[in-house]
């Protein structure tokens, strides 16, 4: 309330016709008065308040806040809700008026020609066809076409309401193109306007461009881009392409629906963009956009257009690569080119083919690099159109962590006689060569625990390696300057430790370090006063030969000589482990049967090995007991058995052409065990030495001086042993005329 007036509660406007529903006949006059407590307004069906001349709203003559609505000659289309409301609030009064027009029982829509009904193919959804009635209790059915189908209200999901229209599950009419309502009055049929059925889907799942990326062309070539769009069912799509050159004459666009499998929940569309002869101005981003009205999805690709075919290496192409033995090496080819070049790899000038260890292509991959992979790798790119070639060399250096040569042998655990001078060597191979080799030592007696040796763990509890400069309590040491030697075709570094007098049993370790790793070798230096071992014969035996091991001890000092052979676990030295002293590891020794005899001052225990095999290799230990102290002394000898190898001739004899009077020198290099006997033949006759024919070096080298015509012929070198023979042949041609000598 305001202005001091008493507060008045606001009531809704009052209509002169106090009914919710009013039914009147067509062509009569509708007049309703509305009274209220403040400014009023009327709303009527179709809301044509501004343009409808037939509807008249006038102020009442007898009171304020009163308006009368008059429609002369009402029609069926005037059926609907008439609402009187206060302008400044939501308060209103409504009456629903049916204008019964039996000639036009359905109210025509505003747009008049036809309506649109949107539906989705969902079993649970209903749709309302808004065929409102001017008569409330009509018998209305729904007609759908094509094919023609009629639906009648069933009191459940299909119904008609004069104020709302015809309600039906949407899937029932999803097949139809159009629907309309039909009413029967006195055997006459009346139809509503037609409603077009639009089945709505709008979801776009994805937009896929093909080729997807990295398309490259040269001027004049044809570009074809396919844009495939997957959507839900009942989707309509607009395609749009965005491209760099808008003024292209040869652009062609084709859009079509793609067939999908029956029962598929998806629809596919394809738009194809074709440019017949691309120019440089066609280079750039191409975007395909698919639009359904309620969704847009896009995808883009960059098209590169080159002036002409070309090939070049990209920046960042390496010139040298370093790797460590065992690494996987990847050398990628970085190139620019169109079309993509053919790629060929060469190593030291030889083509490389892919196999299980090396893969070639855009990337050269060496699965597990080894030293033999060191070298120069050349990659040659060839443009398939212009045949232009580009090459690039990559130098591969394979680094090798230090490897100590002696380590690959069974660790030599020979004993060393007291007081003698001994040299211990470490031959190191490493790439790059080691930047240092250092020697360390510790006492052999350093808390050795046999139980730990059995468990294959380090049996030494003291881990303090001392530098050999600090030889307090040990042997006097001198480390020779490193020497460099070419061994087996490899540059190796040899470090020698000289023990000036072998007084104390000790462990020595050499350690080599380079930039990619370290290697070490532990040498057990076991000093003994007592027994000595000799080998009869004194060379290394070959399989199937016989050998005797003699253990000689001074009989006034020692007694109880026994031979043992160390078992395999005594030899197992794992990387970085300290070797177990054989003499202390009794669990690993096997007693051997041997024969004793004396020669005055010494006892000799002879271990005879007949017909030796590779299994007889290993460490042989002779024990002798001190007569006074009863302390056991031991001495170890490592026996290596050479494998029997059939004769082989390395290298070939070359055919030669010589002039009379010259000298021929040929060499026949053999290998095999036992070493083979070499025999030479000329024209299958044994070659006999004379003044002009000299055989040297166990017949390895043949020299023919002052060659004569009769020296021409087929020469054969034959190497034979008990295991067979090998031979090589060469033909010597002698040119020129034989001159008579003075002597003749």
């Amino acid at each position: 309330a305001s202005g001091g007036l008493p507060s008045v509660s606001l009531h809704p406007p009052r209509l002169s016709i106090q009914k919710d529903i009013l039914t009147i006949m067509a062509n009569t006059t509708l007049q309703i008065t509305c009274r209220g407590q403040r400014d009023l307004d009327w709303l009527w069906p179709n809301n044509q308040s501004g343009s409808e001349k037939r509807v008249e709203v006038t102020e009442c003559s007898d009171s304020f806040f009163c308006k009368m609505l008059t429609i002369p000659k009402v029609m069926g289309n005037d059926t609907g809700a008439y609402k009187c409301f206060y302008r400044d609030t939501d308060m209103a009064s409504v009456i629903y008026v049916y204008v019964q027009d039996y000639r036009s029982p359905f109210i025509a829509s505003v747009s008049d020609q036809h309506g649109v009904v949107y539906i989705t193919e969902n079993k649970n959804k209903t749709v309302v066809i808004p065929c409102l009635g001017s008569i409330s209790n009509l018998n209305v059915s729904l007609c759908a076409r094509y094919p023609e189908k009629r639906f009648v209200p069933d009191g459940n999901r299909i119904s008609w309401d004069s104020k709302k229209g015809f309600t039906i599950p949407s899937y029932m009419i999803s097949y139809a193109g159009m629907v309309f309502c039909e009413a029967k009055i006195n055997d006459e049929s009346y139809q509503s306007i037609m409603y077009i059925v639009v089945v709505v889907g709008y979801k776009i799942y994805d937009v896929i461009l093909s080729p997807p990326h990295g398309v490259e062309l040269s001027v004049g070539e044809r570009l074809v881009l396919n844009c495939t769009v997957r959507t839900e069912l009942n989707v309509g799509l607009d395609f749009n392409w965005e491209y760099p050159s808008l003024k292209h004459q040869h652009k062609k666009l084709v859009n079509r629906d793609l067939k999908t499998q029956s029962g598929s929940e998806m629809k596919k569309f394809l738009s194809t963009l074709t440019i017949d002869g691309v120019t440089r101005s066609d280079q750039g981003w191409y975007t395909c956009a698919a639009s359904s009205g309620l969704m847009t999805k896009r995808n883009s690709t960059f098209i590169r257009v080159h002036e002409k075919p070309f090939v070049a290496f990209g920046s960042g192409m390496e010139s040298s690569v370093e790797a460590t033995v065992g690494d996987r090496v990847r050398i990628p080819v970085k190139y620019l080119g169109y079309p993509p070049p053919e790629i060929k790899w060469y190593k030291n000038g030889r083509p490389i083919e892919s196999n299980h260890t090396i893969k070639v292509g855009h990337v050269l991959t060496i699965m597990e690099v080894s030293e033999k992979d060191t070298g120069n790798y050349t990659v040659i790119l060839t443009n398939p159109i212009s045949k232009e070639k580009q090459s690039h060399v990559i130098s591969l250096v394979v680094n090798v962590p230090p490897q100590i040569g002696e380590k690959s042998l069974i660790s030599p655990v020979d004993s060393y006689q007291y007081g003698t001078t001994q040299s211990l060597t470490c031959t190191v191979y490493a790439v790059p060569p080691p930047h240092h080799i250092r020697w360390y030592w510790q006492l052999e007696e350093c808390a050795y625990k046999p139980a730990q040796a059995v468990l294959m763990t380090n049996p030494y509890t003291c881990k303090e390696w001392r530098n050999v400069d600090d030889f307090q309590g040990g042997n006097k040491i001198e480390v020779n300057k490193n020497q460099f030697a070419l061994i087996e075709g490899k540059n190796k570094t040899v470090s020698t430790l000289v023990i000036q007098a072998a007084n104390v049993s000790a462990l020595y370790k050499c350690e080599a370090v380079n930039k990619v790793g370290r290697g070490e070798r532990v040498i057990s230096f076991h000093v003994i006063r007592g027994p000595e071992i000799t080998l009869q014969p004194d060379t290394q035996p070959t399989e199937q030969e016989s050998v005797s091991l003699w253990c000689t001890a001074d009989r006034t000092t020692f007694e109880n000589l026994t031979w043992y052979k160390s078992g395999p676990q005594a030899l197992a030295v794992h990387a970085g482990e300290v070797p177990t002293p054989v003499c202390k590891n009794l669990d690993a020794l096997w007693r051997m049967n041997a024969t004793t005899f004396s020669n005055g001052t010494s006892d000799i225990l002879i271990l005879e090995l007949q017909n030796v095999s590779l299994q007889d290799q290993g460490d042989y230990v002779c024990f002798a007991q001190d007569r006074k102290t009863k302390k056991r002394h031991c001495v170890v000898r490592q026996l290596t058995v050479l494998e029997r190898v059939a004769p082989m001739i390395t290298g070939n004899l070359e055919n030669q052409t010589t002039s009379i009077g010259e000298t021929i020198e040929v060499s026949c290099t053999t290998s095999g065990n036992p070493p083979p006997q070499i025999t030479w033949f000329k024209d299958n006759e044994t070659l006999v030495e004379d003044s002009g024919i000299i055989l040297k070096d166990g017949n390895r080298n043949l020299t023919i001086r002052r060659v004569r015509k009769e020296d021409e012929g087929l020469y054969t070198c034959q190497a034979c042993s008990v295991l067979g023979c090998a031979k090589v042949e060469a033909f010597f041609i002698v040119e020129g005329a034989q001159e008579k000598t003075n002597l003749e």
Epitope: N124, G236, L237, D238, N240, E242, M295, T296
Partner: antibody
Framework: EVQLVQSGGGLVKPGGSLRLSCAAS????????MLWVRQAPGKGLEWVSA????????YYADSVKGRFTISRDNAKNSLYLQMNSLRAEDTAVYYC?????????WGQGTLVTVSS | DIQMTQSPSSVSASVGDRVTITCRAS??????LTWYQQKPGKAPKLLIY???SLQSGVPSRFSGSGSGTDFTLTISSLQPEDFATYYC?????????FGGGTKVDIK
């Protein structure tokens, strides 16, 4: 900068007409579906109408069907909503929006008041 | 049409709080759900689409989850600029429909 600038709102009597415009810039307008959403004072959002990029597919909410017409002019980068037979319940702020996976760019909105 | 129901209709929270808003669809909509933020007098702003995909430029403190009928928008640590009304919208079936909104205001 990607943006949508709206114009054309105002006061109109019930049964009257109004045309809303939405000018797009900063993106390729002709590639996107566009739509209109409205918001009655103090109420939530209501989708009104949508149009595909080349105007082939057009949709309306039941509440405006037959009275509103959506259209676009790709040459002018513009979207329109022609509103006829306006009712009091059409009073709202009308927003145009660009359609991608969702309605990602919106105009600033324009108020339409339907009152006598 | 698919009805979208948001709860709560309003929530009072402080800066740094974790805020969770839920949205329920009247039938399954898979993951076709979008979240918008609207500040007074401003247009809505897209936050999350397809239930959990963060729109570019939206801070990572906003996250969405859910599938089928029940969905959640979470603000892990509320910032002063996050006080606004949040709407969910389904994009599964025609016509697109919005939830009634959830107003997040200062406690």
């Amino acid at each position: 900068e990607v943006q949508l600038v709206q114009s054309g709102g105002g006061l109109v009597k019930p049964g009257g007409s109004l045309r809303l415009s939405c000018a797009a810039s900063g993106f390729t307008f002709s590639s996107y579906s566009m739509l209109w959403v409205r918001q009655a004072p103090g109420k939530g959002l209501e989708w009104v109408s949508a149009i595909s990029s080349s105007s082939s597919y057009i949709y309306y909410a039941d509440s405006v069907k037959g009275r509103f017409t959506i259209s676009r002019d790709n040459a002018k980068n513009s979207l329109y909503l022609q509103m006829n037979s306006l009712r009091a319940e059409d009073t709202a702020v009308y927003y145009c929006a660009r359609v991608t996976d969702a309605f990602d760019i919106w105009g600033q909105g324009t108020l339409v008041t339907v009152s006598s | 049409d698919i009805q979208m129901t948001q709860s709560p209709s309003s929530v009072s929270a402080s800066v740094g709080d974790r805020v969770t808003i839920t949205c329920r669809a009247s039938r399954g909509i898979d993951n076709w759900l979008t979240w918008y933020q609207q500040k007074p007098g401003k247009a809505p702003k897209l936050l999350i689409y397809e239930a959990s995909s963060l729109q570019s430029g939206v801070p990572s403190r906003f996250s969405g989850s859910g599938s089928g009928t029940d969905f959640t928008l979470t603000i892990s640590s509320l910032q002063p600029e996050d006080f606004a009304t949040y709407y969910c919208q389904q994009a599964k079936a025609f016509p697109p429909t919005f939830g009634g909104g959830t107003k997040v205001d200062i406690k």
